[in-house]
């Protein structure tokens, strides 16, 4: 009974990372409200005048949107009534990094939460046996990383061994002059062993595993975003 805006509602955000040149999502949820027309979602970015995005009365209102976000943002409109205020961001750029605020107003009240959005580049590594080398070696390649990551090798058999003396890592700038291709070669590998190539920067950690036996080669890779 006329309490709109007087109560605080819970708004939850999640620190996330964006891969430059791809779609990103700024995650935000709130207490659901079945009255769509009464929901206002505002996304703001620290240091930017104007809004990143605004959704109200059941539709987008871009009248106050900052130019750097024009044509690059959208909420998941069909999920707003169930409490999803997340923002889809097109063509993530390095300059999109920063502190964002998700502000919500509903018939139940209002609330807001901040999130740190990191931007960079990260990709899955692929390990192959390099038969061109004079001795058997492994080649670990990942097409896009930024900032420059660290690369380390590990082995199941020689746990704790330092492979820096028997590996060579190079970083090749990609055509857009921001991201880099990572190539690391591990020499003198032995058969019937599992090797791991680990690539890490402050945004993501990726691991590629390869098991080489007399009869087959098994590969596996995984990518994990770091929320620190």
């Amino acid at each position: 009974f006329g309490i709109s805006g007087k109560h605080f509602i819970t708004v939850t955000t999640f620190t996330s990372a964006g891969n430059i040149g791809e779609d990103g999502t700024l995650s935000c949820t709130f207490e659901p409200d079945i009255k769509l027309n009464g929901i206002v979602i505002q996304w703001l970015k620290e240091g930017i005048k104007g809004l990143v995005h605004e959704f109200k009365e059941g539709k987008d209102d871009l009248s106050q949107q900052h130019e750097m976000f024009r044509g690059r943002t959208a909420v998941f409109a069909d999920q707003v009534v169930v409490g999803n205020a997340s923002l889809r961001l097109k063509n993530v750029q390095l300059t999109d990094a920063g502190t964002y605020t998700c502000y919500i107003r509903t018939s139940k009240g209002k609330g807001n939460a901040n999130l740190e959005y990191k931007t960079g580049a990260f990709s899955m590594p692929e390990i192959n046996v390099d038969y061109n080398a004079s001795s058997e070696s492994l080649r670990c390649e990942a097409p896009r990383w930024f900032p420059q990551p660290t690369v380390a090798w590990a082995s199941q058999v020689d746990q704790g061994a330092n492979f820096s003396e028997v590996s060579n890592t190079s970083f090749e700038l990609n055509s857009e002059n921001v991201t880099m291709k990572v190539v690391s070669v591990l020499y003198n590998v032995t058969i019937n062993n599992t090797y791991s190539c680990m690539i890490e920067n402050d945004i993501a950690k990726a691991t590629g595993d390869i098991k080489v036996t007399d009869s087959e080669v098994k590969r596996r890779s995984q990518l994990q975003l770091l929320n620190s």
Partner: antibody, heavy 121, light 107 residues
């Protein structure tokens, strides 16, 4: 069902202007960008520009800047392309298309039937 | 502005053939590449967007791939209705750009 219905064929003299309309139905007109593309006889597709009907924001291909104006009328859910100082090279089929992704400018997923504009003295 | 260089400009193929069309962006990296099919006298039809996402209703014999500056449309087994002209579109930047087109003809 998304539908874009364009105005009929036009014949214009060099130096004149033409205004092509594109009436949208089957979705919320103000929530999606609308783009314009042209195709000269026997040639490829050429992006002209687009508009966000919800705010009237526009983007234009540099090649057409100064000669092209894209507008909209939200009361009739209609987008317009106006091209001035026409020359024979502007003879083409002009298409309007809705951009996928709502306020996010996506790829063109629904197209009008095309409007043939002929420029001839 | 980003230009899209499409190749080949035309190709002849038979029903059942595997067909590959490529587009090379003049600069930068983003995944915002779409592919269209156009038949004479008709408006273009969206096949694939965001490099590899198939538009609903498009047969699975069409696939897209690519990264960096190089993007590919593949038709795994050409059907009679696939003879048409294909265009790539770069839509990641403020200014959109089409490739020059590839006409797929019957051998």
């Amino acid at each position: 069902e998304v539908q874009l219905v364009q105005s009929g064929a036009e014949v214009k003299k060099p130096g004149a202007s033409v205004k092509v309309s594109c009436k949208a139905s089957g979705y919320t007109f103000t929530s999606y960008w609308i783009g314009w593309v042209r195709q000269a006889p026997g040639q490829g597709l050429e992006w002209i520009g687009d508009i966000y009907p919800g705010g009237g924001y526009t983007n234009y291909n540099e090649k057409f800047k100064g000669r092209v104006t894209i507008t909209r009328d939200t009361s009739t859910s209609t987008a317009y392309l106006e091209l001035s100082s026409l020359r024979s090279e502007d003879t083409a089929v002009y298409y309007c298309a809705r951009l996928d992704g709502s306020s996010y400018r996506g790829a063109m997923d629904s197209w009008g039937q095309g409007t043939l504009v002929t420029v001839s003295s | 502005d980003i230009q899209m260089t499409q190749s080949p400009s035309s190709l002849s193929a038979s029903v059942g053939d595997r067909v590959t069309i490529t587009c090379k962006a003049s600069q930068g990296f983003n995944k915002y590449v779409a592919w269209y099919q156009q038949k004479p006298g008709k408006a273009p039809k969206l096949l694939i967007y965001y490099t590899s996402t198939l538009q609903p209703g498009v047969p699975s014999r069409f696939s897209g791939s690519g990264s960096g500056r190089d993007y590919t449309l593949t038709i795994s087994s050409l059907q009679p209705e696939d003879f048409a002209t294909y265009y790539c579109l770069q839509y990641g930047n403020l200014l959109y750009a089409f490739g020059q087109g590839t006409k797929v003809e019957i051998k």
